[in-house]
Amino acid sequence: NAKGNYCKRTPLYIDFKEIGWDSWIIAPPGYEAYECRGVCNYPLAEHLTPTKHAIIQALVHLKNSQKASKACCVPTKLEPISILYLDKGVVTYKFKYEGMAVSECGCR
Amino acid sequence: NAKGNYCKRTPLYIDFKEIGWDSWIIAPPGYEAYECRGVCNYPLAEHLTPTKHAIIQALVHLKNSQKASKACCVPTKLEPISILYLDKGVVTYKFKYEGMAVSECGCR
């Protein structure tokens, strides 16, 4: 199902211990980061906020897949999370640790 | 060569006739749009300006490729081109038609 496989936000829970970041992130133990998965086929849907370049690239790929790769499904808007972390040995609280969780995906 | 296959800007010449845009773009006949090609493997190089989310996703993919897809190599900065185009039958000149050519690629 091409529509079901289209670019969208999907769950991705990050466990800080799994990636070795528990050495400096004290809390939380993990968080819902989400990821962007799926294809960016022409025509690119408006909600995926494609750039003109992405539209052109998707169109060229449609006509000749050897000439250009597909546009890619990536985060277009990221949100912060709150963390307790070690900074030079000092436990520090940061309310907004930016760029950690996907809130929107798009074709680029 | 993994380094040679790393995320970078590569040439992509767009012929407006090929994509059917010659019906409204009078000049130029085409332009160098470039595209972003290559892999975003962990560790992500600084010049690819990875977001924290991209770094985490690449790290999760490295540890478990089933859990997360790779970060994607996409345009992070686009530049305008100048065009002559038809607007309601009137030939119009636009000095800066935004978002048409890749100037920088990165991992997202």
Epitope: Y31, E32, E79, V90, Y93 | -
Partner: antibody, heavy 115, light 111 residues
């Protein structure tokens, strides 16, 4: 305006389970964090756990085996569930919003554990 | 795991200056920020100091926070004490085990 309100039972039998809901308004649970804190009569504050904005949960290790915190972001609710209550769990239970600091508290709910 | 030790009670007279202490039992007091909360009888707590020395909007500048590494303690200083300052004051800090640790609280009586 920002509000947090705890709802649940006043009285719980020993060995039973405590369920408290913190209903919030005026902010999003995906932006702010919510602490659960309790205070036995005439005593100090004790941090129980935190529902973090990113969906992660932290527990005070003193409660971890019998405490579960969860949320329903669509209903703006955070839940506290604690098993195997004893008389020394008699306390006022607060939920509180953690932004740059703890800036709003609920009024608290007094829970007595007694047969 | 460390504890935050506060004296149970203190008395002071209106108009004077009082300094409430919060001693860290083990480890360095400067290795995590200290927060101070005020709780009036029968009410919910309110934050008076965060990040060691910052005051939330609405908290009078009579309240200030500091630390002293030689005594391994944090302090909440209240200048020109008012009757309405009579309350219990709790300090709080962070640890890597019990993530948020509170002191036992000091009951301040204003005479």
């Amino acid at each position: 305006q920002v509000q947090l309100k705890e709802t649940g039972p006043d009285l719980v039998q020993p060995t039973q389970t405590l369920d408290i809901t913190c209903t919030v308004s005026g902010f999003s649970l995906t932006t702010y964090n919510v602490h659960w804190v309790r205070q036995p009569p005439g005593k100090g504050l004790e941090w129980m756990g935190t529902m973090w904005n990113g969906g992660g949960i932290d527990y005070n290790s003193a409660f971890k085996s019998r405490l579960a915190i969860s949320r329903d972001t669509s209903k703006s609710e955070v839940f506290l569930k604690m098993d195997s209550l004893q008389t020394d769990d008699t306390a006022k239970y607060f939920c509180a919003r953690l932004g740059y600091y703890v800036d709003y508290w609920g009024q608290g709910i007094m829970v007595t554990v007694s047969s | 795991q460390f504890a935050l030790i506060q004296s149970d009670s203190m008395s002071t007279s209106a108009g004077s200056t009082v300094k409430l202490s919060c001693k860290r039992s083990t480890g360095n007091i400067g290795s995590s920020y200290v927060y101070w909360y005020q709780q009036h009888e029968g009410r919910s707590p309110t934050t008076m100091i965060y990040d060691g020395d910052k005051r939330p909007d609405g908290v009078p500048d009579r309240f200030s926070g500091s630390i002293d590494s030689s005594s391994n303690s944090a302090f909440l200083t209240i200048n020109d004490v008012q009757i309405e300052d009579e309350a219990v004051y709790f300090c709080q800090s962070f640890s890597s085990g019990i993530k948020f640790i509170f002191g036992g609280g000091t009951k301040l009586t204003v005479l």
